[in-house]
């Protein structure tokens, strides 16, 4: 039975040219996390974090995606095109697969604040 819950940073905003941390957290389960996949709005791969093999960053993003902190991902040099949904997929044993969603809005405005709070999607 899948008892866990994915908590995410929810809806966040950040400045164009700046950076943002995408973070998911799996709670309420003792399941072992074997792999976390990070995907973009069109379901294209951003990165994989395998518990035994380490990180795989999609080559086209390698210059502006930094692994971590933890199982999260740091997006750098943000552009307006980065606005959209991001998904974390947790493969776990023995529970199976959990999925979380984050919405990132990249703002032109210099007053854009990086508002991030953990929430259950």
């Amino acid at each position: 039975m899948m008892t866990g819950t994915i908590e995410t940073t929810g809806n966040i905003s950040a400045k164009k040219g700046g950076s943002v941390i995408l973070q998911c957290h799996l709670s309420s389960t003792m399941a072992q996390v074997t792999q976390v996949n990070w995907e973009q709005h069109d379901h294209s791969l951003l990165a994989i974090r395998n518990a035994e093999l380490g990180w795989h960053i999609y080559p086209a993003f390698k210059d502006r995606v930094a692994p971590g902190p933890g199982l999260g991902l740091t997006l750098q040099s943000l552009t307006m095109n980065d606005t959209g949904e991001y998904f974390c997929t947790y493969h776990t044993y023995p529970d199976g697969t959990y999925r979380g969603r984050i919405f990132l809005e990249v703002l032109e405005s210099s007053v854009a604040e990086h508002s991030a709070r953990f929430q259950i999607p």
Partner: antibody, heavy 119, light 107 residues
């Protein structure tokens, strides 16, 4: 065109070390992880480890961990695999292979380097 | 370690006929499976990754299917140039492991 060109065949004595090189061209070297895989004569494929050419961070197959070292030279876009304390069972063709776009598989392979361990 | 087994060890198929190779994995690897083709004296060549995605430049007579622990590579209409050994490999944990290979010949 992606190319991985490996160094030539080696003959080594038991107990010695060998260092195989793999020169990459046709793509941005630091954007793709590199794997090393070996194949003993008439046998299957055996994964040895992988390296991130950008950071130099590597992961190894536990079987080889104490004997293998994978390194890179970013300036020359070259990956290296050094295997120490050689024994006859290490006689094999050694391949470098570029990691694919979408995970830990390999999309391009070098031509292979034959390493013979014999007294 | 994740153990990969392939069946059959070898098969001979008539030109233009279908060839099917199976790969069984000792634990759930979701869809993280690749297939490679190796011709005599050559390096392996990627055919399929993520169980069913065809690699660039691979003819569409090749297809992959399956998830979890059971996977299949199918050659819909065998050509002379398909004579080779075919290996499955999981790409899900350390160590990455390969199946023992399946030799495909012309009948």
């Amino acid at each position: 065109e992606v190319q991985l060109v490996q160094s030539g065949a080696e003959v080594k004595k038991p107990g010695a070390s060998v260092k195989v090189s793999c020169k990459a061209s046709g793509y941005t070297f630091t954007n793709y992880y590199m794997h090393w895989v070996r194949q003993a004569p008439g046998q299957g494929l055996e994964w040895m480890g992988r390296i991130d050419p950008d950071s130099g961070g590597s992961k190894y197959n536990e079987k080889f961990k104490s004997r293998v070292t994978i390194t890179v030279d970013k300036l020359s876009s070259t990956a290296y695999m050094e295997l120490s304390s050689l024994r006859s069972e290490d006689t094999a063709v050694y391949y470098c292979a570029r990691e694919g776009h979408y995970g830990f598989y390999s999309d391009y392979w070098g031509q292979g380097t034959t390493v013979t361990v014999s007294s | 370690d994740i153990v990969m087994t392939q069946s059959p060890d070898s098969l001979a198929v008539s030109l233009g006929e279908r060839a099917t190779i199976n790969c069984r994995v000792s634990e759930n690897i979701y869809s993280y499976l690749a297939w490679y083709q190796q011709k005599p004296g050559q390096s392996p060549k990627l055919l399929v990754y993520n169980a069913k995605t065809l690699a660039e430049g691979v003819p569409d007579r090749f297809s992959g299917s399956g998830s979890g622990t059971d996977f299949t590579l199918t050659i819909s209409s065998l050509q002379a140039e398909d004579v080779a050994v075919y290996y499955c490999q999981h790409h899900y944990g350390n160590p990455l492991t390969f199946g023992p290979g399946t030799k495909v010949d012309i009948k």
